[in-house]
């Protein structure tokens, strides 16, 4: 006998990054047939949701007018048919950004390089934080920490055509709060490869678009790819 | 200590081809892509391309693309510089350089004429 | 193609005194570029890279500034053996280019 329903999906529209004194909407998807969904904030009940007509509705929407460092955190969400529960979902990962400071980013040799020649890219910010995030736009995109007191280094080690792409980064003055994004580095990889077999290029969203994300204590940043198949039409619409 | 030493001066004929080693030593090879620079008599710097001695790729300047061939040997640590079609206005000296950001290390050159 | 123009081709100093040399990119490369000096019979030697930042091995007397487009390499009080020629690399983006260089000379 089951005792639990299948866990939730969670994300933020439009971005789990959020922007000081943006709005943020929390979606919460689960099953037919809820009768309530239930919005958890680093660990407390937040918010409650009890969608008419349940029969009807799959997926709840918490809305936050104004992002501020006080919003930002963990969040999960769980359901309830009849009186059973759902799992609760994955955590994700609210950061509000645009704060206090920018940081410059910079790609060593260069922003043109060679296929197989080592990248690294400098994140740096003179103000007080110690943790660095490096962000590549695109599809199959995927955040990097580093770590230093006024600037971190990145090392793609020897790239390939993969490695193509637009970067930001940000300054992390916790977990949830991060600097304005740098401006973007567009990384160009060229090369004549014989008997070499490169990854393709990855297909990128427009460049003001950053993909989703979700931030889980077990393996830091990293996307939640069921979740991807369904925010992904979302977001390319 | 890092070092690139480059094969002896050549002499050819319009036509033929030249193929020019830079063998370094005093750091990884594979590590660091391996430039080659041309100075004509008298003239500035001209970039001809560069190779990646790990996954042996290449980036050409469009104007030797066809004629230069860049190779790179990491079992002796040596790259090639290879132009065929030769012509007068090829009579030059020929670096290789290390980039390691910016050519930090180069050749001592290797001066190559032309000449029927 | 990115072009490098540098200026003046040629400058006349006298020793002790400070020399400024000027590079202009066709086109922005932020921070990445290059200054090499060559003497006669020599291959060039890298001064500074990525705009200011120095190199280990070059007198302090060598420094850079500028970003964007416009970048300036300054020898604060001139050596006798600093009488060569400079020359300015764009590393943004290929084909790398240099400037056509300018030839320091004695006044």
């Known amino acids: 006998q089951q005792q639990t329903l299948p866990k939730p999906f969670i994300w933020a529209e439009p971005h789990f990054m959020v922007p000081k004194e943006k709005q943020v909407t929390i979606c919460c998807q689960g099953n037919y047939g809820a009768v309530e969904y239930q919005l958890h904030f680093e660990g407390s009940l937040f918010a409650v949701d009890r969608p008419k007509p349940p029969e009807r509705i799959n997926k709840v929407q918490f809305y936050i007018p104004d992002m501020n460092s006080r919003m930002a955190g963990q969040y999960s969400c769980i359901y309830r048919v009849g009186e059973l529960w759902s799992e609760p979902s994955n955590l994700l990962d609210l950061v509000v950004t645009e704060m206090y400071d920018t940081p410059t980013l910079s790609v060593h040799p260069g922003p043109e390089v060679i296929s197989g020649e080592k990248v690294t890219f400098y994140c740096r910010l003179d103000t007080a934080t110690s943790m660095f995030l490096l962000l590549k736009e695109g599809r199959s995109s995927h955040v990097q920490r580093g770590y230093g007191k006024v600037q971190a280094e990145f090392p793609l080690g020897p790239v390939t055509t993969a490695h193509r792409g637009t970067y930001r980064c940000f300054g992390s003055y916790n977990n949830h709060a991060w600097s304005f994004p740098s401006e973007p580095v567009k990384l160009l990889v060229t090369g004549d490869i014989e008997n070499t077999s490169l990854a393709p290029e990855d297909p990128t969203f427009p460049a003001d678009t950053w993909g989703t994300y979700l931030l889980t204590t077990e393996t830091g940043l990293q996307k939640d790819h069921a979740l991807w198949d369904h925010t992904a039409q979302n977001l390319l619409r | 200590q890092v070092q690139l030493v480059q094969s002896g001066a050549e002499v050819k004929k319009p036509g033929s081809s030249v193929k020019v080693s830079c063998k370094a030593s005093?750091?990884?090879?594979?590590?660091?892509?391996m430039h080659w620079v041309r100075q004509a008599p008298g003239q500035g710097l001209e970039w001809i391309g560069g190779?990646?001695?790990?996954?042996?790729?290449?980036s050409y300047n469009q104007k030797f693309k066809g004629r230069a061939t860049l190779t790179a040997d990491k079992s002796t640590s040596t790259a090639y510089m290879e132009l065929s079609s030769l012509r007068s206005e090829d009579t030059a000296v020929y670096y290789c350089?290390?980039?390691?950001?910016?050519?930090?290390?180069w050749g001592q050159g290797t001066t190559v004429t032309v000449s029927s | 193609e990115i072009v490098m123009t540098q200026s003046p081709a040629t400058l006349s100093v006298s020793p002790g005194e400070r020399a400024t040399l000027s590079c202009r990119a066709s086109?922005?490369?932020?921070?990445?570029l290059h200054w090499y000096q060559q003497k006669p019979g020599q291959a060039p030697r890298l001064l500074i890279k990525?705009?200011?930042q120095s190199i280990s091995g070059i007198p302090a007397r060598f420094s850079g500034s500028g970003s964007g487009t416009d970048f300036t390499l300054t020898i604060s009080s001139l050596e006798p053996e600093d009488f060569a020629v400079y020359y300015c690399?764009?590393?943004?983006?290929?084909?790398?280019?240099f400037g056509q260089g300018t030839k320091l000379e004695i006044k």
């Open positions: 990525y705009a200011s």
């Open positions: 350089a290390r980039r390691g950001g910016s050519f930090d290390y």
């Open positions: 005093g750091y990884t090879f594979s590590e660091y892509t």
């Open positions: 690399q764009n590393g943004h983006s290929f084909p790398l280019t």
């Open positions: 190779i990646s001695p790990n996954i042996g790729g290449t």
């Open positions: 086109q922005s490369i932020s921070d990445y």
